[in-house]
């Protein structure tokens, strides 16, 4: 009877606090009045005074909101004295799993990301690699799931679709022939990365492509 | 560090309008309730009313609902208490802070109101 | 709504010694709700117990808070010099979260 199943809290919660969470119960409560409390970071423990507990009732209280990228598991103790203060359980772990909520936006490790190619190349020669990184849960959501597009291309010659980005690795790839340094030395992509696979909040970043010189041209006397 | 600045004192003529902040840093702005306090001269505090900036639920005092007007602006980070129409009993230092049980304090805003 | 009285008004001690100030609320708050604070002279009031007897951060261990029900005591084993200002309850189990009127500590 003296056992709590792990106990999951989103992150974020709006309150009011203190929230009250689950109730630690003693059967020993039918013989003697029990008073209870509880230990550890969270606790009595840095971060202190996250949670408490009603030491007549048991019940566990939240006091205030909690941050899943700050500390994603609590795990406490709880225990159970008479009003002798003699222990009558042995002391009781208590799993608090903090739940995900999608309230960062992903970053790109850079403001400006700087690559070089061939002119000439064939289609699908990878560029580049961009990476944006995302603080939420990318394993149990996809709140931190991040996806890449390309957002625009400057200038748009000979077309506006000369490269592409795979959406989940970041790399930038060749897509269409042409490339020309006579022509275009230097394109700027904008590039954007969204969480939630692509469907939640953006951030963009700069991916500029150097076209490099191939010994293309035949001199000229 | 969690912090809470206020805007600065403020004096104004009985009739006018006004509007004061509070702007939250060191913290997600948006997970906390934002109280005001209203403490007159020489005087106790008062709970004038609580807003949860994410998505601005308000919940003012009855002795306080209708006189004043609670907003939050969760791009900026700040928490505002406004008046239409300055009262001389409106002269008090107000306090922002944060939490059902306020465990951090602006450093209040001096409000006087006098023809 | 609930109506916090606290007692004495002015409490007029020596440092070294014991502070005692009561709060009696109008009808019962569950003990997870009572705070008590700290206000100095032109300064914002300061969290000192939350929970009626949890310490908040950076409190030193003579204060100290307790109570259920009704009745609720902070307690402040030896008076510090800087202990001498106005306290002030608050309940925050239903709104409005009304504050008692404050007790002065001052120096004898």
């Known amino acids: 009877d003296w056992v709590v199943a792990p106990i999951s809290v989103p992150e974020n919660g709006k309150g009011p606090f203190p929230q009250r969470l689950n109730q630690l119960k003693s059967n020993k409560d039918r013989d003697t009045k029990i008073f209870y409390s509880i230990t550890g970071p969270g606790a009595d423990s840095p971060p202190e005074g996250v949670f408490a507990v009603e030491k007549e009732t048991g019940w566990l209280l939240l006091n205030k909101p909690l941050d899943r990228e700050e500390i994603a598991k609590y795990e406490l103790f709880g225990h159970a004295v008479s009003e002798n203060g003699a222990s009558v359980e042995d002391p009781m772990n208590i799993s608090i799993i903090v739940t995900d909520q999608n309230d960062h936006k992903p970053k790109f490790t850079q403001d400006t990301f700087r690559g070089s190619v061939l002119e000439g190349v064939l289609p699908g020669t990878s560029v580049m690699q961009v990476t944006a990184t995302d603080e939420d849960d990318a394993i149990y959501t996809y709140n931190g799931v991040v996806a890449y597009s390309i957002h625009s291309q400057e200038p748009k010659d000979p077309h506006d679709l000369m490269f592409t980005i795979h959406r989940s690795t970041g790399t930038i790839s060749v897509i269409s022939s042409g490339l020309d340094r006579e022509k275009v030395p230097e394109y700027t992509l904008t590039i954007q990365a969204t969480d939630m696979d692509g469907d939640g909040s953006t951030t963009t970043a700069v991916a500029v492509v150097e076209i490099l010189d191939a010994n293309d041209n035949a001199p000229m006397f | 560090e969690v912090q809470l600045v206020q805007s600065g004192a403020e004096v104004k003529k009985p009739g006018e309008s006004l509007k004061i902040s509070c702007k939250g840093s060191?913290?997600?702005?948006?997970?906390?309730?934002i109280g005001w306090v209203r403490q007159m001269p020489g005087k106790g505090l008062e709970w004038m009313g609580i807003i949860y900036p994410g998505d601005s639920d308000t919940r003012y005092s009855p002795s306080f609902q209708g006189q004043v007007t609670i907003s939050a602006d969760k791009s900026i980070s700040t928490a505002y208490l406004q008046w239409s129409s300055l009262k001389a009993s409106d002269t008090a230092m107000y306090y922002c802070?944060?939490?059902?049980?306020?465990?951090?304090w602006g450093q209040g805003t001096l409000v006087t109101v006098s023809s | 709504e609930i109506v916090l009285t606290q007692s004495p008004g002015t409490l007029s001690l020596s440092p070294g010694e014991r502070a005692t100030l009561s709060c009696r609320a109008s009808q019962s708050v569950s003990s997870i709700y009572l705070a008590w604070y700290q206000q100095k002279p032109g300064q914002a009031p300061r969290l000192l117990i939350y929970g009626a007897s949890s310490r908040a951060t950076g409190i030193p261990d003579r204060f100290s808070g307790s109570g259920s029900g009704t009745d609720f005591t902070l307690t402040i084993s030896r008076l510090e010099p800087e202990d001498f200002a106005v306290y002030y309850c608050?309940?925050?189990?239903?709104?409005?979260?009304?504050f008692g009127q404050g007790t002065k500590v001052e120096i004898k």
């Open positions: 060191g913290y997600s702005f948006t997970s906390y309730w």
């Open positions: 802070a944060r939490h059902s049980f306020f465990d951090y």
């Open positions: 608050q309940q925050y189990s239903s709104s409005p979260r009304t």
